[in-house]
């Protein structure tokens, strides 16, 4: 049954909201999709989770959630926020997850984010953000996940990322980014997942991925690359690479020599005509390789050291004979 404390907790539940104990003598409060235009006023000080998403909240006053020192997750997605003032999150010392996606923010709310030292996950996707100030994440030393996809960014906010050394996953997809400069992510040594798909990226700095020593997943799909992304050569832990739906015409010799951990490579929907014979050597974890329409391939690829392929598809090539060693190279 419920303890006396949970009864006290539930008496602090705002009207029309759904509340339940979270198992730690704290309260989960769901006020989503209620047509609210402002924050509820009678929130329990013991609230650990507050969902205010899918309402009509258009502004936050400074310090709108006083005393919620146990609040760990705040959801404000799907409202009409255009601006978040300094002090909007004052006193939220335990806040780990902040969801601000699907609003109308034009800038990262730099001042409001200051001193959220416990914040681990920040969603700013699906807004109208075109500018990320250099110091906007400077106090977010615990941040692990950052969503900036589906905004209006035209360039990588290089300086803003310098303070995010604990970041593990980030998405910058669905923006209007056209170039990735050298050392764009130079301090993100803990980053494991980076999504850059659906941008307008046509050029990569020679050292644009330098510093990403933990990166395992890189998504460059649906961009305007017309050259193979040789900058990946520094990503020694890369497991999953996508650059499909670009304009890449050739894959050079030893293309993936710096990426011996690759398991998956997606590069379909590119007008690839040439593939270096040594391009896919020494990829012991690679399981699937599909080369469609590479019309200038005249020799079967040298798969030395790529011994665990389970599926190999070659269509549209001009290979006239198979090497005698082909059956030795494949499992």
């Amino acid at each position: 049954g419920s303890s006396p404390r949970s009864g006290v907790l539930l008496r602090g539940c705002p009207t029309h909201c759904h509340c339940e104990p979270d198992g730690r003598m704290l309260l989960r409060v769901d006020c989503s999709d209620l047509g609210l235009s402002e924050l509820p006023s009678n929130l329990s000080v013991f609230t650990s989770y507050l969902d205010l998403s899918m309402n009509n909240i258009s502004q936050l006053l400074p310090n709108p959630l006083p005393s919620l020192r146990f609040l760990e997750e705040l959801r404000l997605a799907g409202n009409a926020l255009t601006y978040i003032p300094k002090g909007a999150f004052t006193g939220l010392y335990s806040l780990k997850v902040l969801m601000l996606q699907n609003n109308q923010l034009r800038h990262v709310p730099t001042e409001a984010l200051q001193n959220l030292r416990s914040l681990q996950s920040l969603r700013l996707d699906a807004n109208h953000i075109s500018y990320v100030p250099p110091s906007c994440f400077s106090g977010l030393h615990s941040l692990r996940h950052l969503w900036l996809d589906d905004n209006a960014l035209t360039e990588i906010p290089v300086q803003a990322f310098r303070s995010l050394s604990a970041l593990q996953a980030m998405t910058l997809a669905l923006n209007k980014i056209h170039h990735i400069p050298d050392y764009a992510f130079g301090n993100l040594s803990s980053l494991v997942v980076l999504h850059l798909h659906n941008n307008r990226i046509h050029s990569l700095g020679k050292k644009c991925f330098d510093g990403l020593h933990s990166l395992e997943t890189l998504d460059l799909n649906y961009n305007n690359l017309d050259e193979f992304p040789t900058a990946i050569r520094t990503l020694s832990n890369l497991k999953e690479l996508g650059f499909h739906s670009n304009n890449i015409r050739s894959i050079p010799e030893k293309a993936f020599v710096g990426n011996p951990s690759l398991i998956t490579i997606h590069f379909y929907d590119n007008p690839i005509q040439f593939v270096g014979r040594s391009a896919f050597q020494h990829l012991p974890e690679l399981r699937t390789l599909t080369l469609n329409g590479a019309s200038q391939i005249t020799e079967f690829p040298d798969l030395t050291g790529t011994a665990n392929l389970e599926s190999l598809t070659l269509t549209g090539a001009q290979i006239s004979s198979l090497p005698q060693t082909v059956c030795n190279q494949l499992p």
Partner: antibody, heavy 118, light 111 residues
């Protein structure tokens, strides 16, 4: 602990070649650029070139391009600098260094003195 | 090539006093808000040691009496309170573009 240990001093005659080694330990050798820099006696520092061991990618200072070859052996985590057609003005201490944060040179070898003299 | 010019060539400062070294690049070394300028200390018979990266970021383990500032073409290394162990030659270096280039060095001595 990151360490770069270079080969010993060399004395060469003009026109000869020299190959200096740099053995790395304490980090993932393949993922960081190795830079080569030289310092003539009493002089400043001069960048020669770099290699990314994981991919064998190299870049050279145009000044040295025709005479310098930078290679690596990933099995022993060792980078090499070979300089040919030596002349007296190549007398210098040759350093290898790791390209660290934003390309700054965060760890250096102890240096190898190459003396070119007839 | 980008030419790096340091001033002064040498500097004598009393113990505990401030030492300031300037470095000017022949063109901007800034890119997307980062200044690709680094500072090194070299003592006799030793390899250089990284002090500051990206113009103003203190390398780990370096005493906080060292600081860097500047952007574009003009940069400064400051030692707020000179210690005896700071006697050395100091170099700035750019890696904004190949070839990477160093300043000629500034010798810091005790007055």
């Amino acid at each position: 602990e990151v360490q770069l240990v270079q080969s010993g001093a060399e004395v060469k005659k003009p026109g000869a070649s020299v190959k200096v080694s740099c053995k790395a330990s304490g980090y993932t050798f393949s993922a960081y650029w190795i830079e080569w820099v030289r310092q003539a006696p009493g002089q400043g520092l001069e960048w020669i070139g770099e290699i990314l061991p994981g991919s064998d990618s190299t870049d050279y200072n145009e000044k040295f391009k025709v005479r310098v070859t930078i290679t690596r052996d990933t099995s022993t985590s060792t980078a090499y600098l070979e300089l040919s057609s030596l002349r007296s003005e190549d007398t210098a201490v040759y350093y290898c260094a790791r390209g660290g944060h934003y390309g700054s040179l965060d760890y250096w070898g102890q240096g190898t003195l190459v003396t070119v003299s007839s | 090539d980008i030419v790096m010019t340091q001033s002064p060539d040498s500097l004598a400062v009393s113990l505990g006093e401030r030492a300031t070294i300037n470095c000017r690049a022949s063109e901007s070394v800034d890119n997307y808000g980062n200044s690709f300028m680094h500072w090194y200390q070299q003592k006799p018979g030793q390899p250089p040691k990284l002090l500051i990266y990206l113009a103003s970021n203190l390398e780990s383990g370096v005493p906080d009496r060292f600081s860097g500032s500047g952007s574009g073409t003009d940069f400064t290394l400051t030692i707020s309170s000179l210690q005896a162990e700071d006697v050395a030659v100091y170099y700035c270096q750019q890696n904004y573009e190949d070839p990477f280039t160093f300043g000629q060095g500034t010798k810091v001595e005790i007055k």
